[in-house]
Interface confidence: medium
């Protein structure tokens, strides 16, 4: 069966200065492939974290993801700003040989709403 | 405080259209996700659609695919359901539910309209 | 489709009795879950979400516990108000959002 995303919550609000957790999980790991955050849709979306290792300023893994069979990808953002508002995807990716990684599923999206402190 | 009026319902027959209306108070509509949910007579609730407070995303059930379609006019506070091909198994109380604003539970109900459908 | 069953479908007790129902989901709902209230001829009425939260206005009688899969309604001392039909929803997964088919509370 295809791998399902899910974010369940539709929006968060959080102050400017605090953190937030954007809840993220996966029905599979298969097919294999990383899972990435990312800001906005279509052309101006941002990538915001990637389970790949990289280093994201601000933005840590809330889960260990190391562990076999774990299936929580979700973030947590801390002092946010607010640049930070916007709409955010959880995706799956399915990792390609020569070409690039094909997205495959995303969550629902969650909405964050930075208030002022 | 919030309410939720429902009105359309009625009596009509297999094959025949109906359009449900909700008037929604005394909150700010165009902030929030709204739902139909129905019941038939003497069995539980089951989820019909959802739209979502700009009226950009909508979902339907598949019992309902292709035959009812939800809508929204946030200048007048008033969700829509427009019913066409209605059988049998239509019949039921519609309710119309307001989600909460980050979740998707339904914090306020209006009290329901009656859609019989019968030759 | 995550499919949530409710158990006992009738629960038959007396006024002061404590009620406990019980809702199970086919897959994981972590404590995305709700439980309503409904009595004849009205509108079902929030009671609990998140799995143990109560909404505004609800008697601390009323108590959710559970995660996961498994999850628990107690009414610690029915009042006669409180007979009526209790439904368990999901709201994890993505639409179609999913109800319980009900358990039916009823005076012995």
């Known amino acids: 069966t295809e791998v399902k995303v899910t974010q369940p919550e539709k929006s968060v609000s959080v102050a400017a200065g605090d953190s937030t957790i954007l809840n993220c999980t996966v029905t599979s790991l298969l097919p294999v492939g990383p899972i990435r955050w990312y800001r906005g849709v279509g052309q101006s979306r941002l990538l915001i974290y990637s389970f790949t290792g990289e280093h994201f300023p601000r933005i840590r893994n809330v889960s260990d993801t190391t562990k076999r069979n774990n299936m929580d990808f979700s973030i947590r953002i801390s002092n946010v700003t607010p640049e930070d508002a916007g709409t955010y995807y959880c995706v799956k990716f399915q990792r390609g040989s020569s070409e690039p990684d094909t997205e495959i599923q995303s969550g629902g999206g969650t909405e964050v709403y930075v208030l002022a402190k | 405080e919030v309410q939720l009026v429902e009105s359309g319902g009625g009596v009509v027959q297999p094959g025949r259209s109906l359009r449900l209306s909700c008037a929604a108070s005394g909150f700010t509509f165009s902030s929030y996700d709204v739902n139909w949910v129905r019941q038939a007579p003497g069995k539980g609730l089951e989820w019909v659609s959802l739209i979502s407070g700009s009226g950009e995303i909508i979902y339907y059930a598949d019992s309902v695919k292709g035959r009812f379609t939800i809508s929204r006019d946030n200048s007048k506070n008033t969700l829509y359901l427009q019913m066409n091909s209605l059988r049998a198994e239509d019949t039921a109380v519609y309710y119309c539910a307001k989600e909460n604003n980050r979740y998707r539970f339904f914090d306020d109900w209006g009290q329901g309209t009656l859609v019989t459908v019968s030759s | 489709e995550i499919v949530l069953t409710q158990s006992p479908g009738t629960l038959s007790l007396s006024p002061g009795e404590r009620a406990t129902l019980t809702c199970r989901a086919s897959?994981?709902?972590?404590?995305?879950l709700a439980w309503y209230q409904q009595k004849p001829g009205q509108a079902p009425r929030l009671l609990i979400y998140g799995a143990s939260s109560r909404a505004t206005g609800i008697p601390d009688r009323f108590s959710g516990s559970g995660s996961g899969t498994e999850f628990t309604l107690t009414i610690s001392s029915l009042q006669s108000e409180d007979f009526a039909v209790y439904y368990c929803?999901?709201?994890?997964?993505?639409?179609?959002?999913?109800f319980g088919g009900g358990t039916k509370v009823e005076i012995k």
């Open positions: 929803q999901q709201y994890y997964d993505r639409p179609p959002l999913t």
């Open positions: 897959q994981s709902v972590y404590t995305y």
